[in-house]
């Protein structure tokens, strides 16, 4: 025998008090799958949370954080304060990145500038608190007499794709 509740679609529940007929989910509740015997209560986006997506009869509300904050954790389960670019959040609040480090986002930690010399390159553009350094050609490429112009790529024969 087929369970009569299996016919109840998402957005309804199988109401045992009414001969297992499919009743709509009450306000502020939802069922995201069919055949449910109860509807789940909707999440409330209150306090530091704000509503990103309203609850419907078939899907839960989704929260994000109020302006000046960003989500952490599964399903936006915590809100953390934004900082400016060039800063990181410490236990004492937002602090400027130390010399030699940068942060180009409103969240996360300051990271060290790229060490161009490790790749045998020179610094083309200095780093700042907000931006990483830009590495340029290797110092050998910039020595007197060395051409800084890239030679043209060899022409490909028509109909041949690059390897």
């Amino acid at each position: 025998l087929q369970d009569p509740c299996s016919n109840c679609p998402a957005g309804t529940f199988c109401d045992n008090n009414r001969n297992q007929i499919c009743s709509p989910c009450p306000p502020n509740s939802f069922s995201s799958a069919g055949g449910q015997r109860t509807c789940d209560i909707c999440r409330q986006c209150k306090g530091v949370f704000r509503t990103r997506k309203e609850c419907s009869s078939t899907s839960n509300a989704e929260c994000d954080c109020t302006p000046g904050f960003h989500c952490l954790g599964a399903g936006c389960s915590m809100c953390e304060q934004d900082c400016k670019q060039g800063q990181e959040l410490t236990k004492k609040g937002c602090k400027d990145c130390c010399f030699g480090t940068f942060n180009d986002q409103k969240r996360g930690i300051c990271r060290p500038w790229t060490n161009c010399s490790l790749d045998g390159k020179s610094v083309l553009v200095n780093g700042t608190k907000e931006r990483d350094v830009v590495c340029g050609p290797s110092p050998a490429d910039l020595s007197p007499g060395a051409s800084s112009v890239t030679p043209p790529a060899p022409a490909r024969e028509p109909g041949h794709s690059p390897q």
């Epitope: 999440r43 306090g47 399903g75």
Partner: antibody, heavy 115, light 107 residues
């Protein structure tokens, strides 16, 4: 380091008004919600309510409108008033920062209601 | 309101052993759950949020799991400083509610 420091009267008579204040040191004050939680001796934790820097509040219906919250952004402080106290309001009262969970807490203030 | 129920009320464990604490919600709360540790005379301390994410500075021996209505806090190898009372708390719906606590004591 974010620190929450709280103070207020520790001994009250029935029908009096409980009054506590919490000061926030370090970190940001605006944008967050700031809460009060209490814990009767030897028992569990009960959320009382919350307020943000602009004065928006929410409270536990179990306190039946006896509770009032206020905020002083110039001092980074927020306060709780609970009127018509009874012996059932005897508890350690905590202030805390609400970021979803409560991530920073005050040291707690024991409030005893006794005639 | 959502009722949070913790079990057992008291858990007796030897140092170095594993401790498993349970928390049940009266209705589904997705993963919007926190765990706190409280030692005598101290305020609670946040351990876990979002059911499974460790808060800043919390040792890896603490782990959280679960979603919906059933949640677990596991302490993989109990240290002397871990003997305390542990509370779960939902922040899926207002009013915010806590479980009654589990006391982890030395066996």
């Amino acid at each position: 380091q974010v620190q929450l420091q709280q103070w207020g009267a520790g001994l009250l008579k029935p029908s009096e008004t409980l009054s506590l204040t919490c000061a926030v040191y370090g970190g940001s004050f605006s944008g967050y919600y700031w809460s009060w939680i209490r814990q009767p001796p030897g028992k569990g934790l009960e959320w009382i309510g919350e307020i943000n820097h602009s004065g928006s509040t929410d409270s536990n219906p179990s306190l039946k409108g006896r509770v009032t919250f206020s905020v002083d952004t110039s001092k980074n402080q927020f306060s709780l008033k609970l009127n018509s106290v009874t012996a059932a309001d005897t508890a350690v009262y905590y202030c805390a920062r609400l970021t979803g969970p409560f991530d920073y807490w005050g040291q707690g203030t024991l409030v005893t209601v006794s005639s | 309101e959502i009722v949070m129920t913790q079990s057992p009320a008291t858990l007796s464990v030897s140092p170095g052993e594993r401790a498993t604490l349970s928390c049940r919600a009266s209705q589904s709360i997705s993963s919007i759950l926190a765990w706190y540790q409280q030692k005598p005379g101290q305020a609670p301390r946040l351990l876990i949020y979002g059911a499974s994410t460790r808060a800043t500075g919390i040792p890896a021996r603490f782990s959280g799991s679960g979603s919906g209505t059933e949640f677990t806090l596991t302490i993989s190898s109990l240290q002397s400083e871990d003997f305390a009372v542990y509370y779960c708390q939902q922040y899926y719906n207002w009013p915010l509610t806590f479980g009654g606590g589990t006391k982890v004591e030395i066996k």
